[in-house]
């Protein structure tokens, strides 16, 4: 298992169901860099944290998929969490 | 358009405290802003769950809270000198992206004098 | 804590100027960077976000532009209504902070 992965995934265990909920509902329409396509809407709304962040990294693999995770996390106000997912990622 | 409801002006003695209101929703943001001068983030607050960040700066002055029946946010300025005299606005984050402040109140007018 | 530079502190112009106001953040923000117009005795009002979208409302003369630590505000032409502060903030990172301001005045 990557660094990264490990860092989404804490990252998203560590939200409240009601957290996870509104991340995966801005997930839908956070900006995406050049080349990315986005997860189905009807795959991401039944995903528990271990399996949304299987499928963060296999479509946007770890690097992109650690950034991704932290900007969403910011657009919650979560910018704590994201600099810690962020760290985590970079050591 | 969404109106954030603050009390206009508040008037204190050094060294005591004054808690103010705004009636909002989502996350809450304070700002302070002295007569001539730029803005500085006091902290935030999210209405539906009570998360709380502070500058370290107002950490040991403010203290925020929420009212959630009454969708209120407060802070608590306390210990307060004439440096604290200032408009203090609250703000919300309503974007979906980037966190920026959308919505903002008219701003409480606080005078610290004896 | 991420330190916001605005730059000029304040600008003389004439009606239908092209303006442009700086920001430079002291370490890489993204695009969390918002503009702020302020009237005197009102309260900020939000004009752009992300850096370069525009918010509901803003006319159209008003365009954002910059990532990481260069940021710029541009008014293309400069409406008497236009004359206020205006703010730089980041979202990035907690404490979230502001420039000091660059205030738009008529020549």
């Known amino acids: 298992m990557g660094r990264a992965r490990d860092a989404i995934l804490d990252a998203l265990e560590n939200l409240t169901a009601e957290e996870l909920k509104k991340f995966k509902l801005k997930l839908l329409s956070v900006p995406l860099a050049a080349g990315y396509g986005r997860i189905p809407r009807g795959a991401l709304l039944s995903m528990d944290a271990l399996d949304l962040t299987d499928k963060l990294v296999s479509f946007y693999l770890e690097t992109y998929g650690a950034e991704l995770t932290a900007n969403v996390l910011r657009d919650m106000g979560l910018q704590e969490m994201a600099g810690q997912l962020q760290a985590a990622t970079h050591q | 358009q969404v109106q954030l409801q603050q009390p206009g002006t508040e008037l204190v003695k050094p060294g005591a405290s004054v808690k103010l209101s705004c009636r909002a929703s989502?996350?809450?943001?304070?700002?302070?802003?002295?007569?001539?001068?730029?803005l500085e983030w006091i902290g935030n607050i999210n209405l539906s769950n009570g998360r709380t960040n502070y500058n370290?700066?107002f950490r040991a002055m403010a203290t925020l809270t929420v009212d959630k029946s009454s969708s209120t946010a407060y802070t608590q300025l306390s210990s307060l000198t004439s440096e604290d005299s200032a408009v203090y606005y609250c703000?919300?984050?309503?974007?979906?992206?980037?966190?920026?402040?959308?919505?903002w109140g008219q701003g409480t007018s606080v005078t610290v004098s004896s | 804590n991420i330190v916001m530079t605005q730059y000029p502190k304040s600008m003389s112009l004439s009606i239908g100027e092209r303006v442009t106001l700086r920001c430079k953040a002291s370490?890489?923000?993204?695009?969390?960077v918002s503009w702020y117009q302020q009237k005197p005795e009102q309260s900020p009002k939000l004009l752009i976000y992300?850096?370069?979208n525009r918010y509901t409302g803003v006319p159209d003369r008003f365009t954002g532009s910059g990532s990481a630590t260069d940021f710029i505000l541009t008014i293309t032409s400069v409406q008497a209504e236009d004359l206020a502060d205006y703010h730089c903030?980041?979202?990035?990172?907690?404490?979230?902070?502001f420039g000091a301001g660059t205030k738009l005045e008529l020549k």
């Open positions: 703000a919300n984050s309503m974007v979906p992206h980037f966190f920026p402040m959308d919505y």
């Open positions: 989502g996350w809450t943001h304070w700002v302070k802003q002295r007569p001539g001068q730029g």
């Open positions: 370290e700066k």
């Open positions: 370490e890489n923000v993204g695009s969390y």
């Open positions: 992300g850096a370069s």
């Open positions: 903030g980041q979202s990035y990172n907690y404490p979230l902070t």
